[in-house]
């Protein structure tokens, strides 16, 4: 069957700025920013595009090993970000996957509400633990709140507008930094 | 504007095959989930089966699972529901209905078709 | 599966009243995940309200909805003479995506 549900919380990073660290790079922030969350994010296939399949690895203490993600839709006109988690993780017996959206939108002070939707796959008729949407939820928070402490104590991380060239970015181009380019690899 | 049109319905006898189709324009329709809604004369809505955008899932009210099967065609612009096994108390009205949010859907119906009657008879 | 009872069945109204239909679940929807619908005879449904309270697109602004709880309500602030019909309210939290029985709205 299939749950459904969402979540919203705010951040006083701006959504242009937030989608670029918190989505784009976060292969590259999240082991950086939240080593207790996140040790490792690996492209197992694709560019970062839809298709991609990354590999999630989460550091020894924590439930699950790891998960594997893949990107369905990267919507860098209206910060959206669409993703389904196949594998590992919370995925098994009862889960056959969970589809997400996270969507950052800009608020009038200039900071942003990330509104996060998941659609919860279960086998058969069993029921989404309780446990599992807020342990879902909680992680997010703890990756959001560790890149957005990186951002204000970075200020110029993620904020001036440079073209990569397609070539460097392995045909895609997206506006980035000039403190990325020390982070950045390829998709 | 967006349109939704079934086609295929008619007189069948219990047992017996059917396959609606639905054809849709107006709207980039690779990007949302379709469902079939049914009315049985005189009585209420019956959500019926959920196709994802993209064909990969397939979810069945629990009357017609196993009975039933949902598919599409992205390039052609069409849903099929395909009703094997045929009962009495399928005779109802199908409507099938755009998802109201893109991508994976939020599973309320922001735009339905006229319907199509199958009526199910000895 | 959540079951949705609406109520009244039938609502005898004169034009220009307010209507109050009432919809209870069976159990918690989260994140208001309710939506109504308007149906006129050999008529498809349309949809009024998602979300609980959001209107759809094109939806005249006497048409609301609230909730309190597992109870959903939608008023609408002035019945005009097309606004007769059977409404049916529906959850989308939890699959089977499940209906309520209607409630026929007609003239008093």
């Known amino acids: 069957g299939v749950f459904n549900y969402e979540t919203e919380t705010t951040s006083v990073i701006p959504a242009a700025r937030l989608f670029k660290a918190f989505i784009l790079d976060g292969d590259n922030l999240f082991p950086k920013v939240a080593p207790q969350a996140i040790s490792s994010v690996e492209n197992i296939e694709g560019n970062g595009g839809p298709g991609t399949i990354k590999k999630i690895s989460f550091p020894e203490g924590l439930p699950f090993k790891y998960v594997k993600d893949r990107v369905d839709e990267v919507d860098h006109t209206n910060f959206k970000y669409n993703y389904a988690v196949i594998e590992g993780g919370p995925i098994g017996d009862t889960l056959e996957k969970i589809s997400n959206e996270i969507k950052i939108v800009a608020t009038p002070d200039g900071g942003s509400i990330l509104k996060i939707s998941n659609k919860y796959h279960t086998k058969g008729d069993h029921e989404v633990k309780a446990e599992q949407v807020k342990a879902s939820k909680e992680m997010g928070e703890t990756l959001l709140r560790a890149v957005e402490s990186y951002l204000l104590a970075h200020s110029d991380a993620y904020n001036e507008q440079k073209l990569i060239s397609e070539e460097d970015l392995g045909g895609e181009q997206k506006l980035i930094s000039e403190e990325d380019l020390h982070h950045h690899h390829h998709h | 504007q967006v349109q939704l049109v079934e086609s295929g319905g008619g007189v069948v006898q219990p047992g017996r095959s059917l396959r609606l189709s639905c054809a849709a324009s107006g709207f980039t329709f690779s990007r949302y989930a379709i469902h079939w809604v049914r009315q049985a004369p005189g009585k209420g809505l019956e959500w019926v089966a959920v196709?994802?955008?993209?064909?990969?899932?397939?979810y069945y009210g629990d009357s017609v699972k196993g009975r039933f099967t949902i598919s599409r065609d992205n390039s052609k612009t069409m849903v099929y529901l395909h009703m094997n096994s045929l009962r009495t108390e399928d005779t109802a009205v199908y409507y099938c209905?755009?998802?109201?949010?893109?991508?994976?859907?939020?599973?309320?119906?922001?735009?339905w078709g006229q319907g199509t009657l199958v009526t199910v008879s000895s | 599966e959540i079951v949705l009872t609406q109520s009244p069945g039938t609502l005898p109204l004169s034009p220009g009243e307010r209507a109050t239909l009432s919809c209870r679940a069976s159990?918690?929807?989260?994140?208001?995940?309710l939506a109504w619908y308007q149906q006129k005879p050999d008529q498809a449904p349309r949809l009024l309200i998602y979300g609980a309270s959001s209107r759809a697109t094109g939806i005249p602004d006497r048409f609301s909805g609230s909730e309190s709880g597992t109870d959903f309500t939608l008023t609408i602030s002035r019945l005009e003479p097309e606004d007769f019909a059977v409404y049916y309210c529906?959850?989308?939290?939890?699959?089977?995506?499940?209906f309520g029985q209607g409630t026929k709205v007609e003239i008093k």
């Open positions: 529906q959850q989308y939290v939890r699959s089977p995506w499940t």
């Open positions: 159990q918690s929807i989260t994140n208001s995940y």
């Open positions: 196709i994802s955008y993209d064909g990969d899932d397939k």
């Open positions: 209905a755009k998802d109201g949010y893109s991508l994976y859907g939020k599973d309320y119906f922001d735009y």
